[in-house]
Amino acid sequence: FGISGKHFITVTTFTSAGNIGEDGTLSCTFEPDIKLNGIVIQWLKEGIKGLVHEFKEGKDDLSQQHEMFRGRTAVFADQVVVGNASLRLKNVQLTDAGTYTCYIRTSKGKGNANLEYKTGAFSMPEINVDYNASSESLRCEAPRWFPQPTVAWASQVDQGANFSEVSNTSFELNSENVTMKVVSVLYNVTINNTYSCMIENDIAKATGDIKVTDSEVKRRSQLQLLNS
């Protein structure tokens, strides 16, 4: 690469979060180069000797890969020529969190960028009417969270009300001994009202809404990754 030491190319990364046990993506883009064989992509992780992944001459080369990433990484090979150096990561682990560097070398030059990768567990909450309770209550369940989140209830009718006295939240460790199931019960609910169950940790915020009327129950849920 005669000119690679003299020119710098723009490399862009995005902070992202990985959901433990699921597949993740570490995003990285660079100035495209139609000469695929001249592109080198290296992913490195701070504090780890060896590479996370290397792609060069149009294919993977994992001869220098650290064993903690064995069998778990791939680039989007067909998208490299258009400037996509993002890394697929299989079966995200808590220990995958950290600072990663996406290093690129092409016939145009070289460049790199860092990204912070957070790992945790987050899932959509589901709210159901709990008919077993002595009074009408709502049960909010989310199967996988880590670190332990906070749970808060809100209602459309009683905006600003504090429901901590009339709710009970529990955290049950899942079988893999890392993530936890979140269960929160809100007591003494009234019909013709919309209630929200909000679950949040430093990785994600999830909200489940339920509207209970005489004739129907309507549900909605959403999940938002924080700082990404």
């Epitope: 046990g21 994992l62 001869s63 064995r70 778990r72 791939a74 697929r88 079988s175």
Partner: antibody, heavy 121, light 107 residues
């Protein structure tokens, strides 16, 4: 079209070392996009993954066999090998070599045709 | 290790039947599951990878579905060539493990 072929003795004495070689044709073992695996199947039973090797020589072994397994690769001959030490009758099985689909997806295709190794005195 | 449990272990069916085989993982494996067909004296043949992706050259009557811990292999209309033993395999994490197999036999 990529093909794999196992070779080695069909009979091994108890306490000795089982040695098998897988020869790859129709493609290069040095292609960095793949891991190369050994899998065995006891007579009339299910499949057991033994471990895999990369062209650079890095390996991962199934913990249940780790103390007895050694894998190696010879890129000049386009071959990779399996050694299993201190064998007993319980190691009698059909041994297969196979290639993973990619560095991230290790469903196995293609497979060798398999070779039966009997452990007996 | 992740345990893979297949059911049923034996299945009797007729040509033209719709056949479903189930594979359950002892913990979530996302979609990292493969299905193989094996005939006596032959090596296993890959049918499905990544839970639902059909391997090239495999007839479209084979399909896979599921994610997490529950997976199914479906043969929409059983053909004479389909009588064999079927295995699932997880490649979510080391060591990779296989199900015990399901033998599909003629009723």
């Amino acid at each position: 079209q990529l093909q794999l072929q196992e070779s080695g003795p069909g009979l091994v004495k108890p306490s000795e070392t089982l040695s098998l070689t897988c020869t790859v044709s129709g493609g290069s073992i040095s292609d960095g996009s793949y891991y190369w695996s050994w899998i065995r199947q006891h007579p009339g039973k299910g499949l057991e993954w033994i471990g895999n090797i990369y062209y650079s020589g890095s390996t991962y072994y199934n913990p249940s066999l780790r103390s007895r397994v050694t894998m190696s690769v010879d890129t000049s001959k386009n071959q990779f090998s399996l050694k299993l030490s201190s064998v007993t009758a319980a190691d009698t099985a059909v041994y297969y070599c196979a290639r993973g689909l990619s560095t991230i997806d290790e469903a196995f295709d293609p497979w060798g045709q398999g070779t039966l190794v009997t452990v007996s005195s | 290790d992740i345990q893979m449990t297949q059911s049923p272990s034996t299945l009797s069916a007729s040509v033209g039947d719709r056949v479903t085989i189930t594979c359950r993982a002892s913990q979530s494996i996302s979609s990292w599951l493969a299905w193989y067909q094996q005939k006596p004296g032959k090596a296993p043949k890959l049918l499905i990878y990544k839970a639902s992706s059909l391997e090239s050259g495999v007839p479209s009557r084979f399909s896979g579905s599921g994610s997490g811990t529950e997976f199914t292999l479906t043969i929409s209309s059983l053909q004479p060539d389909d009588f064999a033993t079927y295995y699932c395999q997880q490649d979510n994490s080391y060591p990779y493990t296989f199900g015990g197999g399901t033998k599909v036999e003629i009723k």
